[in-house]
């Protein structure tokens, strides 16, 4: 599996999509897990509804949500209020029995918020009358890792 990179801005929401063959994975629940180390286990973060027919219902675990379009074949994960510690390698999974097939490997990268005055330096940020409170910006940039790129730093 190639790894797809999704970039999001700290404090905002990031939406990750995982396409799959809807017939091949018919009837199977899905999950989103976080890879612990390069060869470590993938720790379950959140999974779709226990009843596959209700997979379209959004399920939350903390700030992470999952929903599955089982007809269209797209699993969508939303990471709300993205934080630097959310960066890392994840997997979208299709569950059968106690086993899981990897649908997509995802590298989440968290970019500093250019409007955050703690890091902004001389960057402009809004004053009291220019608040973005009502804005719901979902920033998602994705790309595939280039050959030779590694999602984890090499270990000695």
């Amino acid at each position: 599996h190639n790894t797809t990179v999704f970039q999001g801005v700290a404090g905002q929401s990031l939406q990750v999509s995982c396409p799959y063959d809807s017939m091949k994975h018919w009837g199977r629940r899905k999950a989103w897990c976080r890879q612990l180390g390069e060869k470590g286990p993938c720790q379950r973060v959140v999974s779709t509804h226990n009843l596959w027919l209700l997979s379209f219902l959004r399920r939350w675990n903390g700030s992470t949500a999952i929903t599955d379009d089982t007809l269209g074949g797209t699993l969508t994960i939303t990471l709300r209020n993205l934080q630097p510690h959310d960066a890392g390698l994840y997997q979208c999974q299709s569950l059968h029995g106690s086993e899981a097939d990897t649908l997509r490997k995802v590298l989440v990268e968290v970019l500093a918020d250019p409007l955050d005055h703690r890091d902004a330096g001389d960057l402009w940020f809004p004053g009291e009358s220019e608040s973005f409170e009502d804005a719901h910006v979902e920033h998602s940039i994705s790309r595939s890792l280039l050959e030779g790129e590694i999602p984890f730093p090499p270990t000695s």
């Epitope: 017939m23 009837g27 199977r28 629940r29 596959w52 059968h96 029995g97 106690s98 086993e99």
Partner: antibody, heavy 123, light 107 residues
């Protein structure tokens, strides 16, 4: 009506190659996994492996990995099981079976079976 | 691999009897278990899936129960056509594995 029809009985000599088939009809063949199951004379059932004809994704039991090859041609709704060099111990009945995922529990079970192909390997 | 152990290996019973066959998994498999019936010279037939769900077209005298490691198949009132060999199979993980079979014979 869902049907899996397997090729006829085969008598072979050790070292010979063989390819048996399983043709599906009455359903969307490329949308269901097809498994192969071995039953040696008077014995139980052994899962050999499975293939998804839609993209030829294949999984093997460690006991059969490297011993057989599972393939499929979705254009003619047929799955295959082949050996490059048969042994006397390959003498058995071979069944193909459709794997159906039941959404109640997100796992799959063998809901339709072929009639079986008897393979006899003897010098 | 998960080992599936059936007991008894064979059982003799009469038409109208209630018969119970057990299947034990070497590790927990939740409810991911199926039961099949096989008659001589024929392919297996799915009876029960997900430990207790009756496959379409299977008579209601067949029932399944259990979860984790211990499972049972019960035939409430044996009919002449029920004399066959029965296999359990785990659908928890690959490779899929079957029990060794229980032969149900006429007493």
């Amino acid at each position: 009506e869902v049907q899996l029809v397997q090729s006829g009985a085969e008598v072979k000599k050790p070292g010979e190659s063989l390819k048996i088939s399983c043709k599906g009809s009455g359903y969307s063949f490329q949308s269901y996994w097809i498994a192969w199951v071995r039953q040696m004379p008077g014995k139980g059932l052994e899962w050999m492996g499975t293939i998804y004809p839609g993209d030829s994704d294949t999984r093997y039991s460690p006991s059969f990995q490297g011993q057989v090859t599972i393939s499929a041609d979705k254009s003619i709704s047929t799955a295959y099981l082949q050996w490059s060099s048969l042994k006397a111990s390959d003498t058995a009945m071979y069944f193909c079976a459709r794997q159906r995922t039941f959404f109640y529990d997100s796992s799959d079970y063998f809901d339709y079976w072929g009639q079986g192909t008897l393979v006899t390997v003897s010098s | 691999d998960i080992q599936m152990t059936q007991s008894p290996s064979s059982v003799s019973a009469s038409v109208g009897d209630r018969v119970t066959i057990t299947c034990r998994a070497s590790q927990g498999i939740s409810s991911w278990l199926a039961w099949y019936q096989q008659k001589p010279g024929k392919a297996p037939k799915l009876l029960i899936y997900a430990a207790s769900s009756l496959q379409s077209g299977v008579p209601s005298r067949f029932s399944g129960s259990g979860s984790g490691t211990d499972f049972t198949l019960t035939i409430s009132s044996l009919q002449p056509e029920d004399f066959a060999t029965y296999f359990c199979q785990q659908a928890d993980s690959l490779p899929r594995t079957f029990g060794q079979g229980t032969k149900l014979e006429i007493k």
